[in-house]
Amino acid sequence: THLGIRLPLRSGLAGPPLGLRLPRETDEESEEPGRRGSFVEMVDNLRGKSGQGYYVEMTVGSPPQTLNILVDTGSSNFAVGAAPHPFLHRYYQRQLSSTYRDLRKGVYVPYTQGKWEGELGTDLVSIPHGPNVTVRANIAAITESDKFFINGSNWEGILGLAYAEIARPDDSLEPFFDSLVKQTHIPNIFSLQLCGAGFPLNQTEALASVGGSMIIGGIDHSLYTGRLWYTPIRREWYYEVIIVRVEINGQDLKMDCKEYNYDKSIVDSGTTNLRLPKKVFEAAVKSIKAASSTEKFPDGFWLGEQLVCWQAGTTPWNIFPVISLYLMGEVTNQSFRITILPQQYLRPVEDVATSQDDCYKFAVSQSSTGTVMGAVIMEGFYVVFDRARKRIGFAVSACHVHDEFRTAAVEGPFVTADMEDCGYNIPQTDESTLMTGRA
């Protein structure tokens, strides 16, 4: 997914785990696959800057070459810069790796805006702050790109964690996580805790800040509070889920639930914003405007373009409503809801106004490719990608930004009938019509 808002981040910031830790509730969920409990070596292994994505340090080749790699659950290729580029401090030098193998095949990935292309090969890959294993994985060596790398983002490649169906050039190219699980005893599960800053960071702070955790092979209890609620993965391509209801400050948008998933709903760490289908976006903005009507904001703010600024420390969080998405549960006719605060959907932007001001962008935007639950959503929650059991779990993140009056929430169960009808069935065509763009 390309941030930006498919980033490459398509619009999340890395900050130190902030906010109050909430008291833990007893775990009620059934037994999880994978090691449980403490993955101390993987905690805080992500960094990033607002709107530019979360990245993990990886090594490729022999001897190992260290690169920062964007963590992207909205795509399925492991692709790294492999040629000089003005925005890259370093890149993968295949000629220096004794274990590189050329697959003699090219790959071309166009986005709605921009593209990258490269040459396919395999090499040895490891994650220093991850499991203590080395695997041979497919690597797309990016030789040419346009509007893909981001100046100052500090990452040099992308780790697509979704399924083979959306890999380029086709689904025969095994994604990294599949290779990892096949070649090791690591359970087929990973989890992400993305920690937004909640306030603008200057460049020094942003570069030094911790951005969150990618736990490979299981779940770390220290990263969430309360219990995990799971929604089925509808289809293994993107991490597709089904939204059955949307509320703004508890007020139902009252739309046909198919609209919420038109033409799909996905969980995408490589997109900055919460992106909503056109009709849903318009209804949601109308409702958010009504809820915050004691103040009026410029048209460009609701388009995600203009910034609104308040004197430092005076942002009126209370006038903005919470947004709740109800997700299909694991039990028939049962759903649960995830609720985010304005602290998640108003994204702090640094270096714009004076140091006396806090400035924000509205990080809910319109989509023509379905709902995208990007960093804006994920920064509120600990998100478990339980591939083994074809489900995604949500719990309140121990690092989400909140205030003394409201916190993000994951609550259930709720009785919801006919949830299967909420899924949209994309008409099948003979040709692939996959659009990679995630702006």
Epitope: S293, T294, E295, F297, D299, F301, E305, Q306, V352
Partner: antibody
Framework: QLQLQESGPGLVKPSETLSLTCTVS??????????WGWIRQPPGKGLEWIGS???????YYNPSLKSRVTISVDTSKNQFSLKLSSVTAADTAVYYC????????????WGRGTLVTVSS | EIVLTQSPATLSLSPGERATLSCRAS??????LAWYQQKPGQAPRLLIY???KRATGIPARFSGSGSGTDFTLTISSLEPEDFAVYYC??????????FGGGTKVEIK
């Protein structure tokens, strides 16, 4: 058509409070489509935004003046007002009231302005 | 803070000539920029908003262009009433607060 007219004393003593009122005629100040603002211009100098207000009473102030500024609205009289406390000679300026339109972003309609001199 | 720098400070031209005024932002303001005209003893008047849209009643000889950090106000053929001071203003950050220092267009 809508018009704005500033009124208030043209001379204020140092350390006192400058008070101005802007009367909106030909339209309602309670329109949800606009903010209302104050801008000033010292003699021979450029424009400085002072602050803006919505009919609900929600205000925004220039950080450099915030500690001294109060802007209020009286929808029954179709007026909004400016108070600037502890004035000095540096506050001598032409004070304009204006409507913030075009997507609540630009000053699309201005009053004629009133010169306020701070002097003992 | 976003700073707007206008150049030149003064532009000396004759009626009928083309005037090109520049406004440069210290960082991108997208297309959220306006131009105002102020004649002596009068209030400013909105000429251009959103970088290139003419406000109501503004003659076609006034045009705006640019996006990001560099913007231009062009007066295709100066009329006697166009000699005035011109200000740019950014509203990328809201509320609208930042004006440029102004460019005076005077008769040569």
């Amino acid at each position: 058509q809508l018009q704005l007219q500033e009124s208030g004393p043209g001379l204020v003593k140092p350390s006192e409070t400058l008070s101005l009122t802007c009367t909106v005629s030909g339209g309602s100040i309670s329109s949800s489509s606009y903010y209302w603002g104050w801008i000033r211009q010292p003699p021979g100098k450029g424009l400085e935004w002072i602050g803006s207000i919505y009919y609900s009473g929600s205000t925004y102030y220039n950080p450099s003046l915030k500690s001294r500024v109060t802007i209020s609205v009286d929808t029954s009289k179709n007026q909004f007002s400016l108070k600037l406390s502890s004035v000095t000679a540096a506050d001598t300026a032409v004070y304009y009231c204006a409507r913030v339109g075009h997507g609540i972003s630009y000053f699309d309609l201005w009053g004629r302005g009133t010169l306020v001199t701070v002097s003992s | 803070e976003i700073v707007l720098t206008q150049s030149p400070a003064t532009l000396s031209l004759s009626p009928g000539e083309r005037a090109t005024l520049s406004c440069r932002a210290s960082q991108s303001v997208s297309s959220y920029l306006a131009w105002y005209q102020q004649k002596p003893g009068q209030a400013p008047r909105l000429l251009i908003y959103d970088a290139s849209k003419r406000a109501t009643g503004i003659p076609a000889r006034f045009s705006g262009s640019g996006s990001g950090t560099d913007f231009t106000l062009t007066i295709s053929s100066l009329e006697p009433e166009d000699f005035a001071v011109y200000y740019c203003q950014q509203v990328y950050t809201w509320p609208p607060r930042t004006f440029g220092g102004g460019t005076k267009v005077e008769i040569k």
